[in-house]
Each structure stands twice: as C-alpha cells, then as structure tokens.
C-alpha cells in the first residue's frame, strides 16, 4: 500500500478521506487505527456503527470521528482540535470477521503553523501536493470551531 500524507494545523480540524470499492466492501464495517510500530499492532481508534446500514451516522471516540458513505465508497475520518501528539501512521480498515483489510495507509502530520510545509518559500494552500517516493500529500485546512458552535449538524 502507498502511504498518503494528510497535513493539518494544530488546533484546527483535519479531515481524512479513504476511498474504496463500494461493491467489494459491501456490508463491511470500517475502522480507523494507529500503527504503533513497524511490526506492532494497529491500535483501534474508532469504528463505524455496529449496524452497517447506519454507517453514515458519525461516531466519535474522543476528538476523532468516523463516518462511511457506503454507496459512494468513501470513509471519512475527522480529527478535531488537532494536536502534535495526533501525528502518526494510521490505517483505514475494512472489517470482516476478525480480519481487517487495509484500505489506505495514512500519515498524519501536524503543523505548528500554516507556514510549515515541505517546500519552504512557497505559499501553502489546501489541495494535493507533489509526490515523493511512495507517498503523496493532501493538505487540509479547516477553521476552528467557535465557542458554543455545534461541530456537525445533528443526524436524525
């Protein structure tokens, strides 16, 4: 698997997307886990709703949310109030029984400032950046929530 790099700014939100073949993974729950070492386990952070038909409902674990568009084939993970310790290597997984298929390997980078980026001197902007080796970068900037603001519209 190639590794996709997602960069966000500390204190803001970062949205990670993992596309997949909706037919191949039909009926399967998804999960987001953190790789603890080269050969270590992938520690589960959050998984989609226990009922696959309700996978579109956003589920939270702490400041991490997951939601699955099972028809469009896109798993979306939101890391709210991004902090330096959120930086790490993660996986989007498709679950079947006790097994898990890797949909995407994701390297999350937390920048101290929007000016921090790989190509110093250039303006940093959201969107996909140049590739390096087996990884490509997706920059994601989203504003911080104002006090009292509801993070996402309530699901009915």
């Amino acid at each position: 698997h190639n590794t996709t790099v997602f960069q966000g700014v500390a204190g803001q939100s970062l949205q990670v997307s993992c596309p997949y073949d909706s037919m191949k993974h039909w009926g399967r729950r998804k999960a987001w886990c953190r790789q603890l070492g080269e050969k270590g386990p992938c520690q589960r952070v959050v998984s989609t709703h226990n009922l696959w038909l309700l996978s579109f409902l956003r589920r939270w674990n702490g400041s991490t949310a997951i939601t699955d568009d099972t028809l469009g084939g896109t798993l979306t993970i939101t890391l709210r109030n991004l902090q330096p310790h959120d930086a790490g290597l993660y996986q989007c997984q498709s679950l079947h029984g006790s097994e898990a298929d890797t949909l995407r390997k994701v390297l999350v980078e937390v920048l101290a400032d929007p000016l921090d980026h790989r190509d110093a001197g250039d303006l940093w902007f959201p969107g996909e950046s140049e590739s390096f080796e087996d990884a490509h970068v997706e920059h994601s900037i989203s504003r911080s929530l104002l006090e009292g603001e509801i993070p996402f519209p309530p699901t009915s």
């Epitope: 070492g37 902090q83 310790h85 390297l107 980026h117 790989r118």
Partner: antibody, heavy 121, light 113 residues
Amino acid sequence: EVQLQQSGPVLVKPGASVKMSCKASGYTFTDYYVHWVKQSHGKSLEWIGLINPYTGTTSYNQRFRVKATLTVDKSSSTAYMEVNSLTSEDSAVYYCARSRVYYGSSLFAFWGQGTLVTVSA
Amino acid sequence: DIVMTQSPSSLSVSAGEKVTMSCKSSQSLLNSGNQKNYLAWYQQKPGQPPKLLIYGASTRESGVPDRFTGSGSGTDFTLTISSVQAEDLAVYYCQNDHSYPYTFGGGTKLEIK
C-alpha cells in the same frame, strides 16, 4: 542501539552562519521525527523545531523560524540544522533528539551529545 | 505559548531521603479527547544531554528506576524520588508535550549533601 552522533564544536564570527549535523544509527531513520533543542550556558532548554525525515516536513518554534533551517539527507540518515546571522545570543549547545513515537512528534527519547557553538569576534 | 514553571529552583538533600519537585503549566496539558496528560520529565546530569524519565505525567520510560514517580493532572505535576541516590545529582526539567511550541520548565537542580 539507537545513536545520534553530532558534529563537533565550532567557533564562528558574528553575522556568519553555521550548519551542524546529526547522524542517526540503530533504527530506521525515516520512522521517527528529529527535533532540535537549544541550551544556552547554565540555562534551560528551548525547542527549536522538528523535521519528519520521511517527508521533509518541518515545524518550527516561531522564535526560531527565521533563525534556523532544518533539513535531512535520507541517504546518509543525517539531519542538519543551519543557524544564520549569528550573534552572541546564539552561543549555546544545540542538541538533536529523536522522538519516541513511531511517525509521531511526541517526546525526546534519544539525544545526541550536543554541538557547542561559540559566537565571538 | 505554554509556560512551564518549576519549583524549587534547587534543593539539597541527603542520600536516602525523599524528594518532591513541582511543575505548573500555564494551560492544561490534559487532552479532553483521550484523558491523557501530555507532560514529560527529563534528567540532565552534568556534562550530559537530557534523558527522558517520565512521560504521560506518570509513565516511567523503560530502564528508569522505580524510585522515580510522576503524578498530577491538568496544570499541576510532581516528580518524586522516593530514596535519593548519589547518582541522582542532576537538573530535572518538565516539558509540555501537548502543544506547539514544546516548552520546558526552568529546571530543578538536585544537590546531594
């Protein structure tokens, strides 16, 4: 055994620049961030910034953004820090340190022996 | 920036005595998402680089003797050495591992009588 071997002490003139190195061994260089920390004589520690050797992405302490530039050479598993426009305030020991967390920035788990920079006319 | 304040700045004790030193942060180091405190303690012996002792406010790094104990939450933290040994002569620093820029306290210098 994880080791970070830093370049030797330097004496430089005010206004000049210095580039110091930190050669890593005993682990996969691209798996862990490298941090740089300043310690002025008899003083506490100041975090300068970090670099992810896998991507080359850097994050700086705002105080050092125009003062320091961090780079890596993956082929030699070496991290570099260049400090420019040197003044007496830049005289210090500079440490490189490796993060504890896999592909993460947290914690300074392994340290180099330090590079002493003396700025004097 | 998060300001880390350590006290006392120095203390002198006899071998075998118990020692406690304090570290206060200007903002909470408790992550509400996972309920972890992002506070680390380092030991710096004369002429050496710092060494990681404690992380997560209370977890000892591997190889660190169990006489070193970290405690506290939010903004108030403590490092305790249950029975000081001669080799514990050092400066002890606390560090904000929660937010950029990472910041250190001014240090507590431990001297052995």
